[in-house]
């Protein structure tokens, strides 16, 4: 008799999830010499242990601690780039500006980027049919808790000037409910972080509005200032030119505003 299986509102675990995580771990540790000591099988076991046989609406940060410990990594604390709703451009930027890091440039972020996973209470099975949706089902699901945990740790590690890339095309350029707005902003350490510099990326079409004057950016400035961290903001009017100028800073067209 087939067991009744919980139907969640979100997509199920990414197919070939165990193989993908293991393969990514191996690839990452090969490319990054400082992480060569990592045993990828142990990483997978710790990852699996965080959610397998557990109710997918009852996951805690504590569940991920063994994985966090194995994935401990030191990135230059003054070279951190946060992002909100503009992941692709942030990743394109760090691919060019190799000394800066997004969360997905770290081992743990790299392992989980764009993947979904969940298990089932009291069985060792991975649920490939459906997983809880953050809004419709529950917030303490395996994926959300993972990103909350790694994002908090990433923000806590930051120092000096921290940069954040924000999407100027969205109605809420700064969204308090995003991971950046709800987790990272509140875990920057005022004793270590001097300034948060926001880069507001204009969309597929430049306009002459100063999006740094947007009410949601003012709200971000207020939150940051109250935490005794300085705030600055820049418009990136042409993201294509911005990336081009990161690649070729000597280009004569890169002296003007981008």
């Amino acid at each position: 008799v087939p067991r009744w299986r919980q139907q969640w509102s979100g997509p199920g675990t990414t197919k070939r999830f165990p193989e993908t995580v293991l393969a990514r771990c191996v690839k990452y540790t090969e490319i990054h010499p400082e992480m060569r000591h990592v045993d990828c099988q142990s990483v997978w076991d710790a990852f699996k242990g965080a959610f397998i046989s557990k109710h997918p609406c009852n996951i805690t940060e504590e569940d991920y601690q063994p994985l966090m410990k194995l994935g401990t990594q030191t990135v230059p604390c003054n070279k951190i780039l946060l992002w909100s709703r503009i992941k692709d451009l942030a990743h394109q930027f760090t691919q060019v500006q190799r000394d800066m890091f997004t969360l997905e440039d770290t081992l743990l972020g790299y392992l989980a980027d764009d993947l979904t996973w969940c298990g089932e209470f009291n069985t060792s099975k991975i649920n490939y049919q459906s997983c809880p949706d953050w809004r419709k089902d529950c917030s303490n699901n395996p994926v959300s808790v993972f990103w909350k945990t790694v994002s908090r740790r990433f923000a806590e590690a930051a120092c000096d000037v921290v940069h954040v890339m924000l999407n100027g095309s969205r109605s809420k350029i700064f969204d308090k409910n995003s991971t950046f707005g709800s987790v990272e902003v509140h875990n920057l350490q005022p004793e270590k972080v001097q300034t948060l510099e926001a880069w507001v990326i204009h969309g597929g079409r430049e306009d002459s509005r100063d999006l740094c004057q947007d009410p949601t950016i003012k709200e971000l400035e207020s939150i940051i200032s109250k935490r005794n961290i300085q705030f600055s903001c820049k418009n990136i009017y042409r993201p294509d030119k911005f990336l081009q100028c990161v690649k070729n800073p000597e280009d004569s067209s890169c002296t003007s505003e981008i």
Partner: antibody, heavy 115, light 110 residues
Framework: SVEESGGRLVTPGTPLTLTCTVS????????ISWVRQAPGKGLQWIGS?????NTYYATWAKGRFTVSKTSTTVDLKINSPTTEDTATYFC?????????????WGPGTLVTVSS | AQVLTQTASSVSAAVGGTVTISCQSS????????LSWYQQKPGQPLKCLIY???TLASGVPSRFKGSGSGTQFTLTISDLESDDAATYYC??????????FGGGTEVVVK
Amino acid sequence: SVEESGGRLVTPGTPLTLTCTVSGFSLSNNAISWVRQAPGKGLQWIGSIYGSGNTYYATWAKGRFTVSKTSTTVDLKINSPTTEDTATYFCAREGAGSSWGFNLWGPGTLVTVSS
Amino acid sequence: AQVLTQTASSVSAAVGGTVTISCQSSESVYKNNYLSWYQQKPGQPLKCLIYSASTLASGVPSRFKGSGSGTQFTLTISDLESDDAATYYCAGGYSGNINGFGGGTEVVVK
């Protein structure tokens, strides 16, 4: 307001610069477009300059026109006029975001290219 | 290149009637609503009637109505008045800050 000036009769190949003088708003956070209209014809967008100083041109206009600005004026240089460039030239302010459109127009300045 | 087509070069209607002017874009305008409408009368500056596809510009009578999204747009003038006789243009804004104008439609009021 916006107002164009500099239109006149020129011979083919003689560069000509038209000026759009603005008042009542700042060019640092407004975009200005240049549009032309040949006698008896429709409107044709040439190019725009934004608060950032970045410029954009219609494909057909690249190399033929140059847009630049100071704090209160926007210039359109016709690099090497031909008889096909005979037209009335307008400058217009471009609205942004939820109010996109050319919301303020000048009366135009007439350029005649003839040998 | 993006092309804006106003199919009718001229439309006519009697005073009190309604005219509809269409504007079709070869590709979607930016955010599906970067489309505006203009009125041109001889010897007068161009006047913006509708911006962002459907928003009435300040001081423009509500007889003028803009509609549409993406690639298909319409300007409707109802309760036509003799003063509405003019040429009407649509303009579109596209990704990459490219703009363009339709060919224009003359409205004749009988």
